[in-house]
Every structure is written in structure tokens, then in C-alpha cells.
Interface confidence: low
């Protein structure tokens, strides 16, 4: 029995619903009473949802899954996963058994956009050219881990003296904090770009520092 799933991962935003597509070709005379359908986590074998003995056996996965009962007879064994969480990310296997048996695995890639970065300076007053300043770029509640890039006002990448930390909250979403240490010129703009590698989404933040003229005694 040939079971078909998409080759590419299904990308779902945290909090939205995702459809994990799975289909088979029913033979003439096929009835749902013959169908055994099991969705499970590929790695741990944990049951997610099942259909057996002509009945939807329900969700075994925090009551957030559903089949498409009206489409099952046409060979559509897709699974709807509601309110996607980071922890849902991974491979799901669709097992279909009629007289013959087939299975295939589909990957779920979870994503969440990063917030617009907030920029902070330390120290934040009485700045003069030649002073060393710490600029912190903070972006919140994204997934997966971000790529962070710094550049100056001319678009030149700044790679030295950058420290980036990413911490996962209880939902598995990342808060990213990237710190750039620079010596101020007469004036300058410093930009931080936080990129979500799955969504190919960039969040930008920038700060412009206008230094006071240097004075000599």
C-alpha cells in the first residue's frame, strides 16, 4: 500500500494550526471499516491519533489533533494539529493498514517570528568620541534560534567584540540578546539584524549616536 506525504517539512507558526498531509489510494469497494490508521511520533513511537474499527479513536496527543473524517474514504488520512507548540516539532509517521500496509513520515518544522529588536546603550549619556560603548540588541519569543548580524551606518559588517546569547523560555521560544562593544567615532549608526532562518524573516533595530565635539584643555 503506497502512502504519500510531502517531501518538504511542513512549516507551522507557533499557535496556529498545521495540517500534516498523508494520503493513500483506496481500492474499489474500500470501506472505512477496513481501515486502521495510526499517527505516531516517529522517534518515540508515541501514539498521536488513530482510526480503527470504523471509528475515530480520538487524540492521544493533548486533545489537539483531528482527522478529516469526510475525506478518509477518499484516501485522505491527513492530520490536523491545533495550536502548534515548539514541542511538537519533529517527525510524525502515518501508518495506514487496510489489507495491505504502508507508512510514511512527514516532518513538522515549528517557527515563530522574532520581535522588532530593542536597542540599549551603556553608558547612555555624556558620550564622547573615543568612548567605549556597549550596545545591546534584544529580540524576543522567536523560534528556532536566530542568526544575528551587526553593521555600521555604511553597511560594513561588525564581527569583532560581539557576544550573542539565546535563552529558551518555558514554551521553548528564544529570547536573543546580542552585545556589541564599540569605540565611538564622531557619530555613527549601528544596526542589528535578527534573522529567523526558517521563516527567512529579518527584524531590524538601529541606534544612532551623535558624539559631542572633543575639547582640549
Amino acid at each position: 500500500l503506497e502512502v504519500q506525504v510531502p517531501e518538504d517539512p511542513v512549516v507551522a507558526l507557533v499557535g496556529t494550526d498545521a495540517t500534516l498531509c498523508c494520503s493513500f489510494s483506496p481500492e474499489p469497494g474500500f470501506s472505512l471499516a477496513q481501515l486502521n490508521l495510526i499517527w505516531q511520533l516517529t522517534d518515540t513511537k508515541q501514539l498521536v491519533h488513530s482510526f480503527a474499527e470504523g471509528q475515530d479513536q480520538g487524540s492521544a496527543y493533548a486533545n489537539r489533533t483531528a482527522l478529516f473524517p469526510d475525506l478518509l474514504a477518499q484516501g485522505n488520512a491527513s492530520l490536523r494539529l491545533q495550536r502548534v507548540r515548539v514541542a511538537d516539532e519533529g517527525s510524525f509517521t502515518c501508518f495506514v493498514s487496510i489489507r495491505d500496509f504502508g507508512s510514511a513520515a512527514v516532518s513538522l518544522q515549528v517557527a515563530a517570528p522574532y520581535s522588532k529588536p530593542s536597542m540599549t546603550l551603556e553608558p547612555n549619556k555624556d558620550l564622547r568620541p573615543g568612548d567605549t560603548v556597549t550596545i545591546t540588541c534584544s529580540s524576543y519569543r522567536g523560534y528556532p534560534e536566530a542568526e544575528v548580524f551587526w553593521q555600521d551606518g555604511q553597511g560594513v559588517p561588525l564581527t569583532g567584540n560581539v557576544t550573542t546569547s539565546q535563552m529558551a523560555n518555558e514554551q521553548g521560544l528564544f529570547d536573543v540578546h546580542s552585545v556589541l562593544r564599540v569605540v565611538l567615532g564622531a557619530n555613527g549608526t549601528y544596526s542589528c539584524l535578527v534573522r529567523n532562518p526558517v521563516l527567512q524573516q529579518d527584524a531590524h533595530g538601529s541606534v544612532t549616536i551623535t558624539g559631542q565635539p572633543m575639547t582640549f584643555p
Epitope: 486502521n36 495510526i38 518515540t44 480503527a52 496527543y61 515548539v86 514541542a87 500496509f101
Partner: antibody, heavy 118, light 112 residues
Framework: EVQLQQSGPSLVKPSQTLSLTCSVT????????WNWIRKFPGNKLEYMGY???????YYNPSLKSRISITRDTSKNQSYLQLNSVTAEDTATYYC????????????WGQGTSVTVSS | DIVMTQSAPSVPVTPGESVSISCRSS???????????LYWFLQRPGQSPQLLIY???NLASGVPDRFSGSGSGTAFTLRISRVEAEDVGVYYC?????????FGAGTKLELK
């Protein structure tokens, strides 16, 4: 009603192979997981492994070099083989189904008491 | 492997009274999906194990509601209210979070 009926010898000689059969009625062996568990004298339970609805297997690493779980879908039977047995393999052996709702252990066979002795 | 510990080898109880049986796991059995993968089985003398509780607190089909399960990620309790003679046997906890599945050593329920 799903029923699991076990059969096999109750006495096996050391170094030989222990072979047991789990016959399933009231449900297809091509659905769900079919597990083997054993209970040693003194009540300790050990999970041995499974054969899945697709025919893939998992074996407890502690037994991996000696165990084989197979099936015959036409007979609706699952088979356990344990090679090179010693007296430490004396136990009661059970087959059990991985259930739709429960994940494990909603139906069990009656158990087969196996003694390894010469 | 996850180690399951049942510290009491046996518990005596008077028929009609309540009793609690405890179990601990060496690792949290709370999955990120919100389920806790702890099972309870009863093996009566001369019988096969019978599933009582699945996913820590769900009563298996046909099991009297005198049985209930509770716990946290690593500490679990099976409570039997109004104990009856048919409740005698060995109670096992089991984790289903990871393979290999592992069982506790068992707690024997004895009537006073």
C-alpha cells in the same frame, strides 16, 4: 474481544533457544504494537521488545544480541526467540498489545512459565 | 534507562479502608505535550498483569473508580479507596516515556 493466546515449551536446556508464540484473535497483528515482557522469580518485570504494525522491531539493549521478535501476518501470530539461554532466563513470558488509547498493555497473554534447566 | 522505584515491597490494609502506593522515577515523565507517561498495573495471584491507570491519572476501561492516579513529573501515587478482597496482588508502576520501558519492583497489597 481481542485475545492473546501464548504457546511454547515450559522447559528449555541451557545454551538452547527459547521459542514462544503469541496468537492474536479479535484483532489484526498488522495494527498496533505487539510487545514481549518477562517476569522473573521474585516479581521483577523486564521489557524485552516489540514488533510494530509495520514489522519493525525494537529490542531492549540488554538482550539485543540474543533476541528476535518476528511475526506471521497470515497466521496473526507474533514470535519470540531468545538464544543461548541460561538459568537467568527462567521467567514467565508475556505478550501484550500496544493499545490505541493507552499506548501499552491493554491486552495481555496468559503467560508462559519457562524454566531453563538441564 | 529510566529507573522506577517502589520503596514499599508490601502494604497491609484492612478491607473497606483506603491505601496509597507510591512510585518514583529517575527522570521526569512529563512530556512537553502535557502528558505524563506513567502507568499502573495490577497482577493478581496466578493472573497476567492488568492495566489500571494510563498516563498517570486516566482510568483504564473496566477499572472501578475506586482506583485513582496522581503525581508530579517524578513522584506518583496510586490510591485505592474502599479496598476489597479482589484488590489483592502486586501493583507495578511503569514508564512509557522512553524505550526500553521500565517497571518498578512492585508493591504487594495484603489484607490485614
Amino acid at each position: 474481544e481481542v485475545q492473546l493466546q501464548q504457546s511454547g515449551p515450559s522447559l528449555v536446556k541451557p545454551s538452547q533457544t527459547l521459542s514462544l508464540t503469541c496468537s492474536v484473535t479479535g484483532g489484526s497483528i498488522t495494527s498496533f504494537y505487539w510487545n514481549w515482557i518477562r517476569k522473573f522469580p521474585g516479581n521483577k518485570l523486564e521489557y524485552m521488545g516489540y514488533i510494530s504494525s509495520s514489522g519493525s522491531t525494537y529490542y531492549n539493549p540488554s538482550l539485543k544480541s540474543r533476541i528476535s521478535i518476528t511475526r506471521d501476518t497470515s497466521k496473526n501470530q507474533s514470535y519470540l526467540q531468545l538464544n543461548s539461554v541460561t538459568a537467568e532466563d527462567t521467567a514467565t513470558y508475556y505478550c501484550a498489545r500496544g493499545g490505541v488509547h493507552y499506548g501499552f498493555g491493554d491486552y495481555w497473554g496468559q503467560g508462559t512459565s519457562v524454566t531453563v534447566s538441564s | 534507562d529510566i529507573v522506577m522505584t517502589q520503596s514499599a515491597p508490601s502494604v497491609p490494609v484492612t478491607p473497606g479502608e483506603s491505601v496509597s502506593i507510591s512510585c518514583r522515577s529517575s527522570k521526569s515523565l512529563l512530556h512537553s505535550n502535557g502528558n505524563t507517561y506513567l502507568y499502573w498495573f495490577l497482577q493478581r495471584p496466578g493472573q497476567s498483569p492488568q492495566l489500571l491507570i494510563y498516563r498517570m491519572s486516566n482510568l483504564a476501561s473496566g477499572v472501578p473508580d475506586r482506583f485513582s492516579g496522581s503525581g508530579s513529573g517524578t513522584a506518583f501515587t496510586l490510591r485505592i479507596s474502599r479496598v476489597e478482597a479482589e484488590d489483592v496482588g502486586v501493583y507495578y508502576c511503569m514508564q512509557h516515556l522512553e524505550y526500553p520501558l521500565t517497571f518498578g519492583a512492585g508493591t504487594k497489597l495484603e489484607l490485614k
